[in-house]
Interface confidence: low
Amino acid sequence: RSTEQGESCSGLLGADAKLAGNTHQHIFNDLSGSVSLAWVGDGTGVILALTTFQVPIFMITIGQSKLYRSEDYGKSFEDVTNLINNTFIRSDFGIAIGPENSGKVILTADVSGSHGSRIFVSSDFGKSFTHQELPFVPLMQITYNPENSNVLLALSNKNELWLSEDFGTNWKKLYDTVCLAKWGRKGTIFFTANHNGSCSNDRGMLELERTTDYGKSFKTVASKIYSFGLGGKFLFASVMTGKGTLRAIHVSVDDGDTWNMAQLPSVGQEQFYSILAANDDMVFMHVDEPGDTGFGTIFTSDDRGIVYSKSLDRHLYTTTGGETDFTNVTSLRGVYITSVLSEDNSIQTMITFDQGGRWTHLRKPENSECDATAKNKNECSLHIHASYSISQKLNVPMAPLSEPNAVGIVIAHGSVGDAISVMVPDVYISDDGGYSWTKMLEGPHYYTILDSGGIIVAIEHSSRPINVIKFSTDEGQCWQTYTFTRDPIYFTGLASEPGARSMNISIWGFTESFLTSQWVSYTIDFKDILERNCEEKDYTIWLAHSTDPEDYEDGCILGYKEQFLRLRKSSVCQNGRDYVVTKQPSICLCSLEDFLCDFGYYRPENDSKCVEQPELKGHDLEFCLYGREEHLTTNGYRKIPGDKCQGGVNPVREVKDLKKKCTSNFLSPEKQNSKSNGSAGGSGGLNDIFEAQKIEWHE
């Protein structure tokens, strides 16, 4: 039952008329080359649209900006360019929206050739703006303190770090020669500085500084730094080891007061580390292979970010463009999807349901045939197109999509065979977090989730003008079409409020006549399609991760199972903006699968038991932890971070303080004398990349 209506799909009565009454066109009298949108606040209905037209002339850029504001989810817009004094706004900095529902907005003006700059700030969701002169030219977008939106941090084009405590009115310079700065927890600022030069040279000689009082005092928390990053509770730094060009990853969970070496494989000069994902429990770390292979190994950490277990070999991660397909499936706990580069250089998709414990191929969709890449026409897998395919300019308009409040739903472009195909992909959907898949739409599409999964909307990816939108109220089983305009438009994007709680979708594009083109948006409100609020009878109980209902431990992942209340596919009703995912957790008995291998141990292929690393047999397991030599008494297991199991298997584990001093605090790395039997990784060369969700920045 893919694409259009099959024999068991009956269309919703009067849908066209209901949608026609809720379709709002807005034509922008604007010829600008680009448009950027920003939702201001959650559930406010406020959208700012910034259009930009710019022409580079010699060393400067001349341009024009227009600002539009909507208060009704994009159904109508008002030209409010006068609020920013018709100033040219730097589109590369975008619209900086304040955290939570602060209503704060910052627009950075382009004041070419000036020693300072100008920002326009709003505290009332963009209703009014005031302008503030800056005593510096920003190098990148100004960032808000996540916990106090009045406090702003900026890095200048002269690598000065500036701070404002009054939402941009007054600024003070905190530090010179700052290469990178980030907000930490509770108003802490971390930054790297070069005390004897510039940021482009001597990158391995940076100091990592911390201030907890907005720059009144500073503490150097680490030296010989190449780069640093924050993810969950973890602070990571790549540090020159004192052995020439080698670098090592160090980790702190106390904001840099104490550090430990990450027990990762050593890496050579041309390799890199990357944090693929991190939360307060654990980290996914990619370690690049030697040579220009385009792949590496994923390791998963313990709860301290110190001990790592091998999770996935031959993980695709190109060094050229820094592309990886690693995707957190946010609609189901513990699920991640990524790509591997197989021996024959084909790319295959792998999925884990247990936070990297085991990886498998995606099950073949029941309604699909194996394509030409399959050796056996009866046995093949689904392979998902993500960042790498998009970077290779394949016909893939969107990366995989999942939303935390649309439980179990994953939508992605893919092909069915032995590997990713370069042929035109189709769109597939999973309603159980990636265990099973169905072809949803033929050919490439743009797609979005509305009303917490109550509606899925799609538009065909085409080079021709379009005027038809497709929608489904049953998680992609049956589709209806709606012609939203008589005059087709050149489609540029689908826009819906982040969080998938809205019932409005905006279709952006432009119309072209003989001499001119102009921006146009169509906003469609689906509230009359979902006429009533969902009631209890509209929901059904669903056990997540269920693969064998006969097994008492069915659904146990990371030590517990969860039952969810999910909307029945047959129910056509509104979850509503206030919808909260209702779940019932149950603790499971512990098994060996609830433990990762401890320091000095590893899991042989297809075995749940941890065995001692051959090179460590007969050695005391001693390692340096928080500046003390520790002796580890273990039978090889450590509880997986975030695992909640109780009872059952309970391997013994004890760490004894050997009362010997050692150093893993690398303020003076040359003095290290730790017996670190896990060969802490040094890395050099290209890029150590740290991030908390999708790759945030490259070294």
């Epitope: 609020n533 009631e535 209890e536 008492y552 209340l565 979850n575 509503g576 909260v580 779940k583 019932q584």
Partner: antibody, heavy 117, light 108 residues
């Protein structure tokens, strides 16, 4: 540490109304199903009502349907039970409880509701 | 409506003895059954949920078994603090619960 603190109990005449509150702390309140359970003096436990995490789904034991309303304010981490048209047989200690699996893993200390003329 | 029956109504035993409490449902409740202990003047305490899972902090002498309609709570060796009233409770539907009448375990 998970804590549930009920309040609002007291003496009320038959036909009267009371509103019980339960203030929760120590866990992500909005993510959990919450319930009210009562116990008449010297008697066993009786489930009264349950509400889903977002507040959109509720259920009641037959004897209180149409008279009692369960609700929650996730911004205040508070569960409520509005009791109207109270009867003598509603006299009981009312417990607020957090759901876990098939049961209730944390309970408040209870608040006594006495319906008497 | 699903009705739970507990037997015996009272169980008189000595410390150190094994206690076996029974709970029967009028129709299948799968494994959605919980057991509680209640002492005078106190709120109930969850012992077992989903028929056989011990709740946090509950000693190993308490165990639950059964599925469908017949369930058992076993206390392998009674401690003095175990003398109390024990209730079973089922969840037949997502948001519908019922309790059994209780079994009193007292000192012989």
């Amino acid at each position: 540490e998970v804590q549930l603190l009920e309040s609002g109990g007291g003496l009320v005449q038959p036909g009267g109304s009371l509103r019980l509150s339960c203030e929760a702390s120590g866990f992500t309140f909005r993510s959990y199903v919450m319930s009210w359970v009562r116990q008449a003096p010297g008697k066993g436990l009786e489930w009264v009502s349950t509400i889903s995490g977002g507040g959109g789904n509720t259920n009641y034991t037959d004897s209180v349907k149409g008279r009692f309303t369960i609700s929650r304010d996730n911004s205040k981490n508070t569960l409520y039970l509005q009791m109207n048209s109270l009867r003598a047989e509603d006299t009981a200690v009312y417990y607020c409880a957090k759901n876990w699996g098939s049961g209730f893993d944390y309970w408040g200390q209870g608040t006594l509701v006495t319906v008497s003329s | 409506e699903i009705v739970l029956t507990q037997s015996p109504a009272t169980l008189s035993l000595s410390p150190g003895e094994r206690a076996t409490l029974s709970c029967r449902a009028s129709q299948s409740v799968s494994s959605y059954l919980a057991w509680y202990q209640q002492k005078p003047g106190q709120a109930p305490r969850l012992l077992i949920y989903d028929a056989s899972n011990r709740a946090t902090g509950i000693p190993a002498r308490f165990s639950g078994s059964g599925s469908g309609t017949d369930f058992t709570l076993t206390i392998s060796s009674l401690e003095p603090e175990d003398f109390a009233v024990y209730y079973c409770q089922q969840r037949s539907n997502w948001l519908i619960f019922t309790f059994g009448p209780g079994t009193k375990v007292d000192i012989k």
